[in-house]
Interface confidence: medium
């Protein structure tokens, strides 16, 4: 059986788009789950992994390796 | 059970602006983007923009762009979208809503808010 | 931005009717189409997504189809429950955009 594009697994019900954009960053593996991007985390592979020590309370990054800090907190890793 | 719970209803002036809330429970908030789309009445459905809360990373409708702000706060797992300069046109209910799993589109929603603009 | 049109926007029907409506996007969505429910002073109903697979607790009745830029819903034996306003969306890329509607009505 060949599948429609996107389509995966016994029945053609697993559905998988690969994608790199806001919504996700992650290709399809050959049962049609998602595997993340170098940098890319979460079930929609849309959580950035931030620069390693950045504080989980103080610290946040929209780009995987940043380190943005909130108001009132500074350094490397807003520690 | 995926939850949002949205603020109350609000009656605006033209030219101000209001921002409504809306409050997730019973999943990992930073998983998942929340969206925002409105329906004026007797309109249909309008996406407004969207926002990543683990990393602040937010799209938007051109339509609306420069005029509305999506924020969300991780410590309280709540979203919110402010709409400004308000005009009678922008009086619509609007609502949260999120992606479900394995690539849904919108299969949760909040109650909705109305937002009414007059003088 | 892909636009998305569907017709009818209203429709008179009976219960027990077979009722189709369509919605054609501006460019290939890719099956990445859904359809929802929305009645009177409620939040809208996934009925659908990726143009076939029904949604959790959804009756067989509803059924879609299509590809590249057309897509159809089929209600296949209408219920007096059936009654209400439905929607496409694409979600293929942002701006996620809905179609204006089809408010289907008891004849």
């Known amino acids: 059986v060949t599948c429609d594009d996107y389509y995966y697994g016994f029945g053609c019900n697993k559905f998988c788009r690969p994608r790199d954009d806001f919504f996700g960053h992650y290709a399809c593996d050959q049962n049609g789950n998602k595997t993340c991007m170098e940098g890319w985390m979460g079930p929609e592979c849309n959580r950035a992994i931030c620069r390693q020590g950045c504080s989980p309370k103080h610290g946040s990054c929209k780009l995987p390796g940043d380190c943005r800090c909130q108001y009132g907190w500074q350094g490397l890793y807003c520690d | 059970q995926v939850q949002l719970v949205q603020s109350g209803a609000e009656v605006k002036k033209p030219g101000s602006s209001v921002k409504v809330s809306c409050k997730a429970s019973?999943?990992?908030?930073?998983?998942?983007?929340m969206h925002w789309v409105r329906q004026a009445p007797g309109q249909g459905l309008e996406w407004m923009g969207a926002?990543?809360?683990?990393?602040?990373?937010?799209a938007y409708a051109q339509k609306f762009q420069g005029r509305v702000t999506i924020t969300a706060d991780k410590s309280t797992s709540t979203a919110y979208m402010e709409l400004s300069s308000l005009r009678s046109e922008d009086t619509a209910v609007y609502y949260c809503?999120?992606?479900?799993?394995?690539?849904?589109?919108?299969?949760?929603w909040g109650q909705g808010t109305l937002v009414t603009v007059s003088s | 931005d892909i636009q998305m049109t569907q017709s009818p926007s209203s429709l008179s029907a009976s219960v027990g009717d077979r009722v189709t409506i369509t919605c054609r996007a501006s460019?290939?969505?890719?099956?990445?189409l859904a359809w929802y429910q929305q009645k009177p002073g409620k939040a809208p109903k996934l009925l659908i997504y990726?143009?076939?697979t029904l949604a959790d607790d959804v009756p067989s009745r509803f059924s879609g189809s299509g590809s590249g830029t057309d897509y159809t819903l089929t209600i296949s034996s209408l219920q007096p429950e059936d009654f209400a306003t439905y929607y496409c969306?694409?979600?293929?890329?942002?701006?996620?955009?809905f179609g204006g509607g089809t408010k289907l009505e008891i004849k």
């Open positions: 809503t999120r992606r479900g799993y394995d690539d849904y589109p919108f299969a949760y």
């Open positions: 926002i990543q809360p683990g990393g602040g990373g937010t």
């Open positions: 990726n143009a076939k």
């Open positions: 460019g290939n969505i890719h099956n990445y």
């Open positions: 969306q694409h979600f293929w890329s942002a701006p996620w955009t």
């Open positions: 019973g999943y990992t908030f930073t998983d998942y983007e």
